[in-house]
Interface confidence: low
């Protein structure tokens, strides 16, 4: 039809002016389409190199709408993970410094000749909070014991206490229980508590990175030409006005957006779990009760101590023998104050209550994210028509669109008409990423039974048999010396989005 | 649907202790907060305080500690509302309400029970 | 104790007025997460508070959309752009920032 021929380019003109291009390359009247290569070849405004131009710029265009989806989910990831990061770090702060106001006066010298031993177990408490790789367990009974041995030493100056001595007093305290039931009460409350804290945080880091990695896979060239045809073939086809098909579009972004889809199903594991361990922030052996006083548990054991003094020396002279008199040391100490510090009345506050809230909510939101990425970058990014009629763009021409809407996921688009999918070879940063959410659900699941996976059948030496894989950089698989706690470096990167000084911060 | 169960009235004397319920059925008991509210005849709303149902974990406005105790039976989806010490000031109508397990609001109220202090 | 102040106490309206309900708190009450937990209910004669905004500006489910909050810090507002008969009742305002959390006075709107 020599009237089509003579068609004025003036609307592509001004499209593709509007992107940066030369003008220059813009045919004034549409020309014959042998040339294109993606477009369908009728009569076109589009000369080869405006085709690969609009190519390359479809094709950058998907991907900078896919980071920016990407880019909201982290960021709502990374302030829940700050959130619950510094509710979670307050409440340990705020319990050391109670002990270091209260104990002094409490305890007297039993305190302030020990601080050390105190401060030592907060921090160590603190890096296991934050992901290294140590025993909590271990920690703790190291913890009594040496505070054992130094308490003795300090009631019993009147005695020589040499280290073989003290070594019979280690061996005899399971059986004597120095310090009362606090020790077996902290650890079990401990445990669970912090494995809970630390396994939902590392979640949310876990989240956070699994989204930033997946948004830098790059779309292959078979999606470049779909999406191509899909946003700019009308325009060289002289059919500006018409927007793309809802289920054309939809099928192009299945295709293009195949193997993220596989991640939904671990994805929605993950983000379960995590809401199911909030279960375990509250009661007696939540989160906010035990973390927020340690320093109870402490005072209890000291008291403990203090009361059993007696029957404790007499039952250790039993065991390990009688000890050789100081003859330089003072009298036998004075029977102590009973430090009292009832446990803590924690006013209310209804922070975590609010954040679990908050997260609830937004993690649901986000649970169908990776298979609502093609429907929702059409409807927000694509213009698309507003109806499935014959009047909008199918990737042909102006008219219905008649294939069926593919299935989610690589599997299902083995009959994608719009992209050639090679179902065969799923992208190997995906499925690396679908083994992290894998790995950290097991965390979680672990957690949410009490059980700290790193150290489940953990030999002597410390190491662990889980995988580490929750801690995102090669700081958090260093192990941990437990005898070196007063020279170790915060291990701050274990939970992903925390800087190295903001660890230093509240150690 | 969701509801919240709760006995019209309760009648108590000066110094004794009721014990009220709110039976919740329509949904999953334990994934919702269960909160109190007080409204005496012609004033305003005053919170109580929560329950955990799922852990047991409650939590009170200081003014209530000593007055109220609030308990949960997972296993007939009950909440519980001791009142103690009872005085003509705790004459009022007692809300037990759902706390929206993703929205932190007050999303179903039970009809209220009537508590009359009288000797 | 954060102080929820309503005003006015009773509001007079005829059906299609549009109606104005302030509600100011003691303090701020934007909990520390960001958020604004100021909410709006409505209580009919005999029946149980039902809920009709949160966070200040959300209507709730099946809530009329001549029901509207506004406000930010310490003052709010709810507004209802033509009273029906349906609305007479006592609103009450009420915060779940800080614990414990407080309702206002409420104030009843009811027929000129």
């Known amino acids: 039809d020599p009237a089509s021929k003579s068609r004025s380019c003036g609307e592509v003109r001004q499209i593709y002016g509007a992107k940066g291009f030369s003008l220059s390359d813009v045919p004034q009247a549409e020309i014959s389409g042998e040339h294109l290569r993606i477009c369908p070849q009728g009569y076109t405004c589009c000369t080869s190199e405006m085709e690969e131009n609009l190519a390359n710029r479809s094709h950058a265009e998907l991907e900078t709408a896919l980071r920016d989806s990407s880019r909201v989910l982290q960021a709502m990831l990374a302030t829940q993970l700050r959130s619950f990061d510094d509710h979670f770090q307050h409440l340990l702060n705020d319990s050391e410094r109670t002990l270091q106001a209260t104990f002094p006066g409490a305890f007297g010298e039993l305190y302030t000749q020990n601080a050390r031993a105190f401060r030592d177990l907060y921090s160590e408490l603190r890096l296991y909070y934050r992901g290294a790789n140590l025993h909590l367990e271990e920690t703790l009974a190291e913890f009594w014991a040496r505070l054992l041995e130094r308490l003795f030493k300090q009631l019993h100056p009147q005695l020589l206490l040499p280290d073989d001595y003290l070594d019979c007093l280690g061996k005899q305290a399971e059986a004597l229980r120095p310090f009362g039931e606090a020790p077996r009460e902290l650890r079990l409350r401990a445990t669970r508590a912090f494995v809970a804290a630390r396994s939902f945080v590392q979640g949310l880091g876990v989240a956070s990175d699994v989204v930033r990695k997946v948004a830098q896979v790059p779309l292959g060239p078979e999606c470049s030409r779909a999406v191509m045809k899909l946003v700019y073939c009308a325009h060289c086809l002289g059919v500006p006005g018409a927007r793309p098909c809802p289920d054309y579009c939809r099928n192009v972004l299945k295709g293009c957006l195949a193997n993220q889809a596989d991640l939904d199903a671990e994805w929605r594991n993950l983000l379960d779990s995590m809401v199911l361990i909030t279960d375990k922030f509250w009661g007696t052996s939540g989160v906010e009760s035990v973390i927020g006083s340690v320093h109870t548990w402490l005072a209890e054991a000291i008291n403990a101590l203090q009361d059993n003094r007696d029957t404790l020396t007499a039952k250790v002279i039993q065991g390990c023998g009688n000890p050789k008199v100081n003859p330089q040391g003072p009298g036998p100490e004075e029977k102590r104050r009973r430090g009292k510090l009832a446990p803590r009345e924690r006013p209310p506050s209804g922070t975590l209550e609010k954040l679990v809230s908050e997260a609830k909510a937004q993690l649901r939101d986000v649970q169908d994210f990776w298979i609502s990425l093609p429907g929702t970058l059409c409807s927000e990014k694509m213009a698309l028509s507003t109806a499935s009629d014959d009047r909008c763009w199918n990737g042909m021409a102006r008219g219905r669109y008649l294939p069926e809407v593919m299935g989610d996921g690589l599997a299902n688009q083995i009959n994608n008409p719009e992209v050639e999918v090679d179902i065969t070879k799923p992208d190997m940063t995906i499925r690396q990423q679908i083994m992290q959410l894998k790995i950290m659900t097991n965390r979680l699941r672990s957690a949410y039974n009490g059980n700290d996976v790193d150290f489940q059948d953990a030999s002597d030496d410390g190491s662990g048999s889980g995988s580490g894989d929750g801690c995102l950089d090669d700081l958090c698989s260093r192990k941990v010396s437990r005898k070196s706690s007063s020279s170790r470096t915060p291990l701050t990167h274990a939970l992903p989005g925390l800087s190295e000084q903001e660890g230093q911060k509240t150690s | 649907q969701v509801q919240l169960q709760q006995p019209g009235a309760e009648l108590a004397k000066p110094g004794a202790s009721v014990k009220m319920s709110c039976k919740a059925s329509?949904?999953?008991?334990?994934?919702?907060?269960m909160h109190w509210v007080k409204q005496r005849p012609g004033q305003g709303l005053e919170w109580i305080g929560y329950?955990?149902?799922?852990?047991?974990?409650?939590e009170y406005n200081q003014k209530f500690k000593d007055k109220a105790t609030l308990t949960a039976d997972k296993s007939s989806s009950t909440a519980y509302m001791q009142l103690s010490s009872l005085t003509s000031e705790d004459s009022a109508v007692y809300y037990c309400?759902?706390?929206?397990?993703?929205?932190?609001?007050?999303?179903?109220w039970g009809q209220g029970t009537t508590l009359t202090v009288s000797s | 104790d954060v102080v929820m102040t309503q005003t006015p106490l009773s509001l007079p309206v005829s059906l299609g007025d549009q109606a104005s309900i302030s509600c100011r708190s003691s303090?701020?009450?934007?909990?520390?997460?960001?958020?604004?937990?100021l909410e709006w209910y409505l209580q009919k004669p005999g029946q149980s508070p039902k809920l009709l905004i949160y966070?200040?500006?959300n209507r709730f489910s099946g809530v009329p959309d001549r029901f509207s909050g506004s406000g930010s810090g310490t003052d709010f507002t709810l507004k209802i752009s033509r009273v029906e008969a349906e609305d007479l009742g006592v609103y009450y305002c009420?915060?779940?920032?800080?614990?414990?959390?407080?309702f206002g006075g409420g104030t009843k709107l009811e027929l000129k």
């Open positions: 309400v759902r706390l929206g397990d993703y929205s932190y609001y007050f999303d179903y």
């Open positions: 329509g949904y999953t008991f334990t994934r919702y907060w």
């Open positions: 329950i955990n149902p799922s852990s047991g974990y409650t």
């Open positions: 303090q701020s009450i934007v909990h520390s997460n960001g958020n604004t937990y």
């Open positions: 966070k200040v500006s």
């Open positions: 009420f915060q779940g920032s800080h614990v414990p959390w407080t």
